[in-house]
C-alpha cells in the first residue's frame, strides 16, 4: 500500500503530528509534539475509559441505584463500566438498565413460555387445547388437563384454558 492518507490506527492528528492515542483505562494529559510523547494518566477509582482515546476526563462508573431496584452485576474497572441488573422478581426497562419493573404475571388461561430474567420480562403464551392455567403467575406453565381415562374415570365437565377437566365415576349398567 502507498503512504497513508491518515494517521495510523491508534493515532490521532494534532498540530500536524500523528500522536499515540491513550490506551483503555487512561486519559490524555498532553498531546505529543515532534519532540515529545503523548502523556496519559490512569483513570481514578470509580472511573473508566473503554477505548483507545484522547479524552481529557474519564467517565464515571454507572451507579446501580437500589431505590430503582438495581444492583451490581459486574463491578467496573478502569477499562469497563459497571454493569447493573435488577433485583429478584424485577427486570430492566431498557438495554442500558437504568431502572427496573416488576416481572409480568401470566393471567389465568395463559402460561409462562419463558421465565423473566434480570434483563427480560416474562413471556406468556395462551394455553392450547388440552392445557390450562387457573392462576396468575410469573412462573407457572400451562398444565395438561387431567386424563380421566388413566384413572378409570370419565369426564364429567370439559376443561377450558382456565380450568381442568372434572372427572367422575363411570355409570354402572343395571341388569
Amino acid at each position: 500500500p502507498e503512504p497513508p492518507t491518515a494517521c495510523r490506527e491508534k493515532q490521532y492528528l494534532i498540530n500536524s503530528q500523528c500522536c499515540s492515542l491513550c490506551q483503555p483505562g487512561q486519559k490524555l494529559v498532553s498531546d505529543c509534539t515532534e519532540f515529545t510523547e503523548t502523556e496519559c494518566l490512569p483513570c481514578g477509582e470509580s472511573e473508566f475509559l473503554d477505548t483507545w482515546n484522547r479524552e481529557t476526563h474519564c467517565h464515571q462508573h454507572k451507579y446501580c441505584d437500589p431505590n430503582l431496584g438495581l444492583r451490581v452485576q459486574q463491578k467496573g474497572t478502569s477499562e469497563t463500566d459497571t454493569i447493573c441488573t435488577c433485583e429478584e422478581g424485577w427486570h430492566c426497562t431498557s438495554e442500558a438498565c437504568e431502572s427496573c419493573v416488576l416481572h409480568r404475571s401470566c393471567s389465568p388461561g395463559f402460561g409462562v413460555k419463558q421465565i423473566a430474567t434480570g434483563v427480560s420480562d416474562t413471556i406468556c403464551e395462551p394455553c392450547p387445547v388440552g392445557f390450562f392455567s387457573n392462576v396468575s403467575s410469573a412462573f407457572e406453565k400451562c398444565h395438561p388437563w387431567t386424563s380421566c381415562e388413566t384413572k378409570d374415570l370419565v369426564v364429567q365437565q370439559a376443561g377450558t384454558n382456565k380450568t381442568d377437566v372434572v372427572c367422575g365415576p363411570q355409570d354402572r349398567l343395571r341388569a
Partner: antibody, heavy 125, light 106 residues
Framework: EVQLVQSGAEVKKPGSSVKVSCKAS????????MHWVRQAPGQGLEWIGN????????HYAQKFQGRVTITVDKSTSTAYMELSSLRSEDTAVYYC??????????????????WGQGTTVTVSS | DIQLTQSPSFLSASVGDRVTITCSAS?????MHWYQQKPGKSPKRWIY???KLASGVPSRFSGSGSGTEYTLTISSLQPEDFATYYC?????????FGGGTKVEIK
C-alpha cells in the same frame, strides 16, 4: 525516554537463519509501526520491512520477500526480525527504527525518529 | 521504486566552510528527510519535512528543495558535523534512502 534496545551480535553460517530482537520502552508500543533497516559494511541504509505491532500486519521490501519475517510480542513490547537462507552479502548491521507520521498541509509522510543501537550479523563459513 | 542519488558521495571540507549536499529523486516527492550518522553509531533524525530541524540540531543546518531536488546545507562547518548524511523518502513505497554523503575534515 523512548528507547529501542537490540539483541547482541551474531555470527552465522551461510544457509542458516538469524533472529534479531528489538525491545521498546518509553512509549505505547502498539501505537507506532516498527521498521527494520540494514547497513552493509561501508554501505548505505537499506529498508527491509515494517510491522504494525497492534495487529501484526507486515510489509517487506521485494528484495527480502520470502526470506524475512517480522513479528512482535506485545506482552514484552518486543519486535523481531528473522532472516533465513543467509549468505555472505547479508553481513550487515541491522537496525530497528520507530516510524513517525506527520501531516504537512496536503499529504501525510513519515520518517524514523528513534533507532535501536544496531545488531551486527556476520555470515561466514 | 524511487531512487535517491546523493552528491557528492564524499566531501572534504574545512571548519567554517559552507557545505551543500544534494539529494536527487527519480520521481517527484512531497518531502525529504535527512539523517546524520557517525562511525559505529545509529543514524539520528536530523532534518524532517524537508526543512524542519530535529531536536538539538544546531541552526547552522538547513534543508530545502521540492519536486526531485533537495539540499542539506551547513552554513559554517564545525568539528562535530563531520559524519555521513543520508536522505530518505516515503512519498512512494518502499521507503528508500540515498547512498550517503561522507563529510570529512580537509
Amino acid at each position: 525516554e523512548v528507547q529501542l534496545v537490540q539483541s547482541g551480535a551474531e555470527v552465522k553460517k551461510p544457509g542458516s537463519s538469524v533472529k534479531v530482537s528489538c525491545k521498546a520502552s518509553g512509549y505505547t508500543f502498539t501505537s507506532y509501526w516498527m521498521h527494520w533497516v540494514r547497513q552493509a559494511p561501508g554501505q548505505g541504509l537499506e529498508w527491509i520491512g515494517n510491522i504494525d505491532p497492534s495487529n501484526g500486519e507486515t510489509h517487506y521490501a521485494q528484495k527480502f520477500q520470502g526470506r524475512v519475517t517480522i513479528t512482535v510480542d506485545k506482552s514484552t513490547s518486543t519486535a523481531y526480525m528473522e532472516l533465513s537462507s543467509l549468505r555472505s552479502e547479508d553481513t550487515a548491521v541491522y537496525y530497528c527504527a520507530r516510524e513517525r507520521i506527520y501531516y504537512s498541509g496536503s499529504t501525510y509522510d513519515g520518517y524514523f525518529d528513534v533507532w535501536g543501537q544496531g545488531t551486527t550479523v556476520t555470515v561466514s563459513s | 521504486d524511487i531512487q535517491l542519488t546523493q552528491s557528492p558521495s564524499f566531501l572534504s571540507a574545512s571548519v567554517g566552510d559552507r557545505v551543500t549536499i544534494t539529494c536527487s529523486a527519480s520521481s517527484s516527492l512531497s518531502y525529504m528527510h535527512w539523517y546524520q550518522q557517525k562511525p559505529g553509531k545509529s543514524p539520528k533524525r536530523w532534518i524532517y519535512d524537508t526543512s524542519k530541524l530535529a531536536s538539538g540540531v544546531p541552526s547552522r543546518f538547513s534543508g530545502s528543495g521540492s519536486g526531485t531536488e533537495y539540499t542539506l546545507t551547513i552554513s559554517s562547518l564545525q568539528p562535530e558535523d563531520f559524519a555521513t548524511y543520508y536522505c530518505q523518502q516515503w512519498s512512494s513505497n518502499p521507503w528508500t534512502f540515498g547512498g550517503g554523503t561522507k563529510v570529512e575534515i580537509k
